[in-house]
């Protein structure tokens, strides 16, 4: 194929690939009709003047994962057709001025994963057609004003994984076509007002893993097309009331790993397209009414690993499309019976690792599509009669690591678990905590003939029970179950019963990655 160097492979499609540690210089002669050239994993340390002079038809040039530390300014001369240039994963510390001069067709320039210490306006002044510029994974400490002023067609700019401590409010002002801006994993402590005002077409803004403490109230007000906003793992302690007010297209917002203490009603929205909201690993202590009410299309709400001890009954108002709600690893002791009433489409709720002592009988009354409930590691001693009976799609229920009180009142829960086991997978069985003589024994094989009578009257469910059984299509009113009768009846039925005998001590620990944050 018009002469292929011995160190390379050349294909019919004018593609040349040169790889291997034995290569220490750009191989020659390269086929004059080459359109794609890849020089990968070699020991080339420098590019001298015009090594590609005779392959002017080249469209894509990848020089990646080499030892490249020095480039002569004229290295890319005569590559006027070049559209894609990658120098990623090398050891470049300095870019010579004029290096990209003459690359009039260049659309993608990848300089990521080098050791670049600075960039200057003159570096990219000739790259007027550039659409993608990758500078992530370098050692940049600041971006001078004007660095990107000539890149008016740029749609993607990645400055992540550098050492940026501040950003000039003017540095992005001419990038009106930018769709993706990534500034993640830097050392930014604040972002000046107006920094993003010129980015009217921005769709993704990645600011995660910085040290941002405050967000200016109008920081995103000009970014009406923003779809993805990543603010996780910063030091944000409060959200200005209007900070998210002008983001009607937003469908992904991450705020996990910050220092948020409270969420004020209406802080989110209106965001009619937001599908996921990640708020885990903050310091939130309560959720007021209507805090998420603008998020009509929200499907995933992650509030785990906070310090939530109180949830107002109307906190989840408006979340009619929510599928997954994660509240695990908080400080919840009680839940209002109506708190989940609006979540008609909820499929997965994680409440594990809280301090829940009891659940209202109607807590899941309107959430008929629930498929998974995680209640492990709370302070539950029993559950109200019929609490799961209407949940015909339930296929995962985790109840282990609670201090179950195995007196006669536990029988309905024990029966439900036994009769529904094929729907509940093979997870860990709940274990009795009291009375003391049965501590550590499996709840579902207690000897019911010697069950301890209860010494209290449990809470009576506040809703009529219509247990879910696949073979029973409906129940006439005359046979509906009244929970009051058996729960408040005296204990004479148990006069011959003294203690619970349980002989099974097996415990299998099971975890899923669902709701792990």
């Amino acid at each position: 194929y018009h002469g292929c160097p011995s160190e390379c492979t050349c294909s019919r499609a004018s593609q040349v690939e040169c790889t291997g540690a034995r290569i220490v210089a750009v191989p020659t002669p390269l086929p004059w009709n080459a359109m794609s050239l890849q020089i990968l994993n070699t020991h080339i340390t420098e590019l001298n003047e015009s090594p590609f002079l005779n392959i002017s038809a080249l469209i894509a040039l990848r020089i990646e994962k080499n030892e490249l530390s020095r480039i002569t300014p004229g290295a890319f001369r005569n590559l006027g057709s070049l559209r894609y240039l990658s120098l990623a994963n090398n050891k470049l510390q300095v870019l010579p001025i004029g290096l990209f001069q003459g690359l009039d067709s260049l659309e993608s320039l990848l300089l990521s994963s080098n050791q670049l210490l600075q960039i200057q306006p003159a570096h990219f002044s000739q790259c007027s057609n550039l659409k993608e510029l990758q500078l992530h994974g370098n050692h940049l400490e600041y971006i001078p004003d004007g660095a990107f002023d000539h890149l008016v067609g740029l749609t993607k700019l990645n400055l992540g994984k550098n050492s940026l401590t501040h950003i000039s409010p003017r540095v992005f002002q001419h990038l009106g076509n930018l769709q993706v801006l990534r500034l993640y994993e830097n050392r930014l402590t604040d972002i000046p007002m107006g920094t993003f005002d010129g980015l009217v077409n921005l769709q993704e803004l990645a600011l995660q893993q910085n040290q941002i403490g405050l967000l200016s109230p109008g920081l995103f007000h000009n970014n009406h097309n923003l779809q993805r906003l990543y603010l996780s793992n910063n030091h944000i302690s409060q959200l200005p009331p209007s900070v998210f007010m002008q983001l009607p297209q937003l469908n992904r917002l991450t705020l996990f790993g910050n220092s948020l203490k409270e969420l004020s009603p209406g802080i989110f929205g209106p965001m009619p397209n937001l599908r996921e909201l990640w708020l885990y690993d903050n310091h939130i202590s309560s959720l007021p009414d209507n805090v998420f009410s603008n998020l009509r299309q929200l499907q995933v709400l992650i509030l785990s690993r906070n310090q939530i001890s109180f949830i107002s009954p109307g906190a989840f108002n408006g979340l009619t499309e929510l599928r997954e709600l994660s509240l695990h690893t908080n400080a919840l002791q009680d839940l209002d019976g109506n708190v989940f009433r609006m979540l008609a489409n909820l499929q997965n709720i994680s409440l594990q690792n809280n301090r829940l002592r009891q659940l209202p009988g109607n807590i899941f009354a309107n959430v008929n599509g629930l498929m998974a409930i995680q209640l492990q590691n709370n302070q539950l001693e029993n559950l109200p009669l019929g609490i799961f009976d209407h949940l015909g799609k339930l296929c995962e229920l985790r109840l282990y690591d609670n201090p179950w009180r195995c007196d006669s009142d536990i029988l309905p829960l024990r029966n439900w678990l036994l009769l529904n086991q094929p729907r509940l997978g093979t997870d860990t069985v709940p274990v009795c905590f009291s009375p003391a003589n049965v501590r550590g024994q499996s709840l579902i094989i207690i000897n019911v003939n010697v069950a301890v009578p209860s010494v209290h009257v449990p809470e009576v469910p506040s809703y009529p029970e219509t247990p879910w059984y696949p073979d029973t299509p409906s129940y006439p009113d005359t046979t509906s179950v009244s929970s009051t009768t058996e729960l408040t009846s005296p204990v004479e039925d148990y006069t011959d019963l003294t203690t619970i005998q349980v002989t099974d001590d097996r415990s299998v620990w099971g975890m899923t990655q669902a709701q792990s944050g």
Partner: antibody, heavy 113, light 111 residues
Framework: QVQLVQSGAEVKKPGASVKVSCKAS????????IHWVRQAPGQGLEWMGY??????KYNERFRGRATLTSDKSTSTVYMELSSLRSEDTAVYYC????????WGQGTLVTVSS | DIVMTQSPDSLAVSLGERATINCRAS??????????MNWYQQKPGQPPKLLIY???NQGSGVPDRFSGSGSGTDFTLTISSLQAEDVAVYYC?????????FGGGTKVEIK
């Protein structure tokens, strides 16, 4: 003392229905499942279904022919089997709890023309 | 349906000797780390009586000479020292999933 007392023997013609009762005492009626099991003469045991708090579950072999009901006021469970045929001749037992820990004395149903 | 196969069909054992009855399920009857295998004793003209539930747990009032073992698909009922009153038919049963199914029975007699 837990007891399950069943109704007396029945003789039925093919195509007819039979309704067997099982009266429970000595425990909280609503806290336990009641199963029905039958045993043809000289044969093994066959589970028919259970009832618990008005909810029922049936063996597919009996679905549509067997109906389980209960009357909480009298702590009584009923098993009705319709469209009887000669092979339904058997002793029918009720049994308490998931683990069948107490059984009724059995009711012989004879189907003969 | 889960099919339960008992062996042997009948067993003659001397008084005071050990009697062992096996039961195999067509698929595992384990859940939650517990085996949902139960054993019943039926004497002529009487209803069955629960001996062992969940593979190894004795029913109320069952003598200590009756024990159960096994997991997964293979289970054993052992009568450590056969007594005259143990002459009966013994049934295994799985309660892992509906329909709950019984083995065909093993008749135990005195040799």
């Amino acid at each position: 003392q837990v007891q399950l007392v069943q109704s007396g023997a029945e003789v039925k013609k093919p195509g007819a229905s039979v309704k067997v009762s099982c009266k429970a005492s000595g425990y909280t009626f609503t806290s336990f499942v009641i199963h029905w099991v039958r045993q043809a003469p000289g044969q093994g045991l066959e589970w028919m279904g259970y009832i618990y708090n008005q909810g029922t579950k049936y063996n597919e072999r009996f679905r549509g022919r067997a109906t389980l009901t209960s009357d909480k006021s009298t702590s009584t469970v009923y098993m009705e089997l319709s469209s009887l045929r000669s092979e339904d001749t058997a002793v029918y037992y009720c049994a308490r709890d998931y683990y069948f820990d107490y059984w009724g004395q059995g009711t012989l149903v004879t189907v003969s023309s | 349906d889960i099919v339960m196969t008992q062996s042997p069909d009948s067993l003659a054992v001397s008084l005071g000797e050990r009697a062992t009855i096996n039961c195999r399920a067509s698929e595992s009857v384990d859940y939650y780390g517990i085996s949902f295998m139960n054993w019943y004793q039926q004497k002529p003209g009487q209803p069955p009586k629960l001996l062992i539930y969940a593979a190894s747990n004795q029913g109320s009032g069952v003598p200590d000479r009756f024990s159960g073992s096994g997991s997964g698909t293979d289970f054993t009922l052992t009568i450590s020292s056969l007594q005259a009153e143990d002459v009966a038919v013994y049934y295994c049963q799985q309660s892992k999933e509906v329909p709950y199914t019984f083995g065909g029975g093993t008749k135990v007699e005195i040799k």
